[in-house]
Structures are given as C-alpha cells and as structure tokens.
C-alpha cells in the first residue's frame, strides 16, 4: 500500500493510473466504501462523502489514463485509505494528515517558552525534528518545547515529521519580541546632551502597549520613575514625565529619549520596560549613564566620573601630547600644582578611549 503524507490546510493529490492511455470509468472510494468521486463519460460525479466540497480531479489528465483525487484544505480526519477502482483493479493509497501548530501565539516575549504541538491521525507514531533559525535541533513526539526563547530564535522554524520512512516539512514563523540590545551604556561629559535609544528587534504593523523608565541614580538611595508613556499603533504619547530631569521623548518608533544635559546627579542606570497589549510579561532594556567632570580648584586639577563603570576602566590625567601624569582604576584622579597647558581627562578601556574631557590650566604668575 502506498503511503502519502499531507499537511493540514494544504492540498494533496493522490494518483491513480490505468494501463490504457485513454479516458475510462474510474471511482475513488474511502475505506468505508463510500464513493468520493468518479466519472460518467467526460463529466465529474461526486458521491455522498464528507469530502464532497473539497474533492476534485484533473479532467485534463483523464485522456492520458490518469485519474487523480485532489483533496483541498486537508483535515486530520481526512487520514484514511483511499481506493481507486479502474479497469477492474484497485489501487490503495494511505493518506496520513499531520498538523503542527505553536501553542498560543507565534509572537512571544524573550525568555518565554515555545511549545509546538503535532496533530496526528490515530494509530500513527510520527517523530518530529525542528531546526531553529540559529541552527539548534530539537526532537520530540507529540509536543516539542523550547524554554527561554532568545532573540536569535526569531525567524522560520523548519520542522520535519517522519512516518513510514516518508517525511513532511512544516515551516513556522516565530517572532521573538525583544529590544535589539539587552543593555547599553552612554558616556558623556558634564553638560552634554544625552540621547537614549531603545530600538525593537521586531516589526509589526500595529504595536500597542505602555512603558516606563525607572532610574537609579548612583547618588540616590532609591530609584525614581523618570517617564511613563503609551504606545498605540506605533505612536508614542507621554503620560507623565519627571520635572528633574526634563526629558523629551520622540513620538514615533524607535523609542527615543533626550536628556538636556548630563549631570553627576543623573549618572546611574535605568530600566525601560514595555508591556505590550495582549501579552503577559514585559520587554526590558537596561541603560547606563556615565558622566565625567574635569575641574580646577586653586592648585588642584581633578577629574571624576560618576555612574556604573567596570573595575577595569582606567581614569587618567595627562598634559596634551605628553605621558599620563596619573592613571588609576578609580573614579577620581587629581594632580596638584598642574603645569600650564591643555590637560586631558581620559576614561579608557584596554587603551580605547570611551570619554574625554579637556581643561585649560592657565599659567600662575
């Protein structure tokens, strides 16, 4: 018996060939001997089966002795043995229809689980193997689960169902809802304007939700809500904004915030959360602000940084075009009685300058 695998919702064509290359009488029946379709001369006739409105044939092939049965919009319950009767002989084809669906939604938040469920006909014992967009293979039976979805899991999942040495392939598009970056850091000199951007890693036609940026300043004992906003059809509208600092927010995506100036009291880290409509859980992006200040008070030249710096960052004070006078893995450095000239304060990571502030020391007479 020939075995054909089909996909739920698809169309399948079961073949039936006569030895005579001409149009002769044929019938397709199911295992209960109920007629599905056949011919009467050059006319297609249909029987009382459940497939009535979904069954068809190709009349153009009858003259060549081919009498296919086409079943559209396949259902799991269409799985059956189909019999083609032609020229006093019977051809049997076993059709097995499978369906593969994502548990709830194909748009899932980063960190959530994806469950793929296989629908299969009674009596079948298929195996399933899925390959994620990043090349990870998972195997299972009726259900496959992937916990802790990552951004790289966004894209087309290709799943192969194997039964009776035959296989059928499913493609499922999964969108992982997340920010492009989990964390970002902005380095600014005191007084400079600060821009925070929160690009999303996905695009949807209509995006609705609400968000908030909480800020923990290094100098503050507790965190503070800096801004709350709504998002409707990709349009951002600010609901509430703190008066200090006076933030501005762009009205369109990607989410974008502007801080008029970087000040030591703002240095710290923030957490932007975005709750999307009809989704449980929230998207998060951490943002950090490091602020540098170089000052000269009487005979003391000082350079300080505030905010979340890693212990391996180096803070240096040097006279332009000269070796560093002082260089430490600390958040403040100073030089007593600095000589006249243009001094540079540098914050660097393995030789790469992250932040630089210049201060002119005038000669003392």
């Amino acid at each position: 018996k020939k075995v054909v695998l089909g996909k739920k919702g698809d169309t399948v064509e079961l073949t039936c060939t006569a030895s005579q290359k001409k149009s002769i009488q044929f019938h397709w029946k199911n295992s209960n001997q109920i007629k599905i379709l056949g011919n009467q001369g050059s006319f297609l006739t249909k029987g009382p089966s459940k497939l009535n409105d979904r069954a068809d044939s190709r009349r153009s092939l009858w003259d060549q002795g081919n009498f296919p049965l086409i079943i559209k919009n396949l259902k799991i319950e269409d799985s059956d043995t189909y019999i083609c009767e032609v020229e006093d002989q019977k051809e049997e084809v076993q059709l097995l229809v499978f369906g593969l669906t994502a548990n709830s939604d194909t748009h899932l938040l980063q960190g959530q689980s994806l469950t793929l469920t296989l629908e299969s006909p009674p009596g079948s014992s298929p195996s399933v193997q899925c390959r994620s967009p990043r090349g990870k293979n998972i195997q299972g039976g009726k259900t496959l689960s992937v916990s802790q979805l990552e951004l790289q899991d966004s894209g087309t999942w290709t799943c192969t169902v194997l039964q009776n040495q035959k296989k059928v392939e499913f493609k499922i598009d999964i969108v992982v809802l997340a920010f492009q970056k989990a964390s970002s850091i902005v380095y600014k000199k005191e007084g400079e304007q600060v821009e925070f951007s929160f690009p999303l890693a996905f695009t949807v036609e209509k995006l609705t939700g609400s968000g908030e940026l909480w800020w923990q300043a290094e100098r503050a004992s507790s965190s503070k809500s800096w801004i709350t906003f709504d998002l409707k059809n990709k349009e951002v509208s600010v609901k509430r904004v703190t008066q200090d600092p006076k933030l501005q927010m762009g009205k369109k995506l990607p989410l974008h915030l502007t801080l008029p100036q970087a000040l030591p009291q703002y240095a710290g880290s923030g957490n932007l959360t975005l709750a999307l409509e009809a989704k449980t859980g929230k998207l998060h992006q951490e943002v950090n602000l490091v602020v540098m200040r170089a000052t000269q008070l009487q005979k003391n030249l000082t350079c300080e940084v505030w905010g979340p710096t890693s212990p391996k960052l180096m803070l240096s004070l040097k006279l332009e075009n000269k070796e560093a006078k002082v260089s430490k893995r600390e958040k403040a450095v100073w030089v007593l009685n600095p000589e006249a000239g243009m001094w540079q304060c540098l914050l660097s990571d393995s030789g790469q300058v992250l932040l630089e502030s210049n201060i002119k020391v005038l000669p003392t007479w």
Partner: antibody, heavy 119, light 107 residues
C-alpha cells in the same frame, strides 16, 4: 486625488471666536495625523495645533494653549479649529495639513483661509 | 519646546549655483526633520522628510542630510523655479516647531 479645503476664516473683533473647518478627501482621514499651521502677514510659518491619527491625542503651541481647540469628525472627514479669545497677533493665513504615513512629513496642504482679528 | 535655528535668513544666488541651508535643533531630534518650500501666496510644499528622504515628485537636485541636532538642505544646481522661501520643521515631538525660514533670491 488627496485634497484639503479650509473654510471659516473672516474678520473678527479681539476677544471674539471663530471656527475653522478643513474638509478632507481622497484618503482615509481617521488614519493620519493632521495639523493646523499659520502664517502672519510677512512672517514665517508657525505650527499651531495637531491631532494624532490613531490615538486622537491633541497638541498645541504654547501661544494658543487654552484658547484654541482642535477636533475631528471622522464621519464628515473634517478637521476643526475652534478659536476663542482671539487676539490681534492671531491674524494670519491658517493652513490645514495632513501628515504622511508613519509621520513622514506634512505631505498635503490646503490653500489656507485668512483670519483677521481687528476692532 | 524644541527651538529650530535656521541660517542664513536670506540668500542671493545665480541660476546653476549650489546652495546650502542649515537648521540646528536645540536638542537631539534623531532624523525627525522635514524641509518645505513656499512661494508667495501659496501653501508650503514638502521637499524632504526624515532628514534625507526625497518626497515623491520632488526633483533630485534637492537633497537633505544630518541627524541629531544639525541638518542641511542642499540644492545642487539652482533652477529659476527654486527661488522661494525654505523652512525646516522638527516633528520629533509636539509641539512641532519651524525654523525662521530662508529667503532664496535670484542674483
């Protein structure tokens, strides 16, 4: 063809009121943000007020806040600007403008209607 | 509100000249800026949106550049019909604000 046609301008005394209308045609009116922009005689362009497409939120320039009200009637495809407590400095040509998809600039403008505030 | 500073306020040039008009925002506005042309007695016309995207039907001699706070409108080779007043408009957030305008006159 996408078109905007303003009406309702005229001569009004200081402290008086006027309602401007902007009839829209040729596009899905409710889907786009709309704005009112004015131009005083011999002066530059000044954005006056706006209404967002999806949310319907309304926004105003500081110079008109509390005196002007923007609104839209989706069934009539019409944008309105209710102007109260009018001042001499409100004298201008008032334009109605449609914003492009995803706020890609004010791509369609009306011909304007003139408002004169004078005693 | 965000302030937009446009320069120069007026400019005289010959047909065929390359002309540049600049606009500076008082704060970062990404690329949320448009350029408009207005002729006497007429409504403004959109030339450039999103700082550098050419509006459909606008000649390619017009181009825009910049992001953040500094923006430029360039007309590569002035044509007689280009003599008009040009405005920049920030649409980063409400209230929108226009630059003061640049009047481009024929020499």
């Amino acid at each position: 063809e996408v078109q905007l046609l303003e009406s309702g301008g005229g001569l009004v005394q200081p402290g008086g009121s006027l309602r401007l209308s902007c009839a829209a045609s040729g596009f899905t009116f409710s889907s786009y943000a709309m704005s009112w922009v004015r131009q005083a005689p011999g002066k530059g362009l000044e954005w006056v007020s706006g209404i967002s497409g999806s949310v319907g939120s309304t926004y105003y320039a500081d110079s008109v806040k509390g005196r002007f009200t923007i609104s839209r009637d989706k069934s009539k495809n019409t944008l309105y600007l209710q102007m109260n407590s009018l001042r001499a400095e409100d004298t201008a040509v008032y334009y109605c403008a449609k914003e492009g998809y995803d706020w890609s600039g004010m791509d369609v403008w009306g011909k304007g209607t003139t408002v004169t505030v004078s005693s | 509100a965000i302030q937009m500073t446009q320069s120069p306020s007026s400019l005289s040039a010959f047909v065929g000249d390359r002309v540049t008009i600049t606009c500076r925002a008082s704060q970062g506005i990404r690329n949320d800026l448009g350029w408009y042309q207005q002729k006497p007695g007429k409504a403004p016309k959109l030339l450039i949106y999103a700082a550098s995207s050419l509006q459909s039907g606008v000649p390619s001699r017009f181009s825009g550049s910049g992001s953040g706070t500094d923006f430029t409108l360039t007309i590569s080779s002035l044509q007689p019909e280009d003599f008009a007043t040009y405005y920049c408009l920030q649409d980063y957030n409400y209230p929108y604000t226009f630059g003061q305008g640049t009047k481009l006159e024929i020499k």
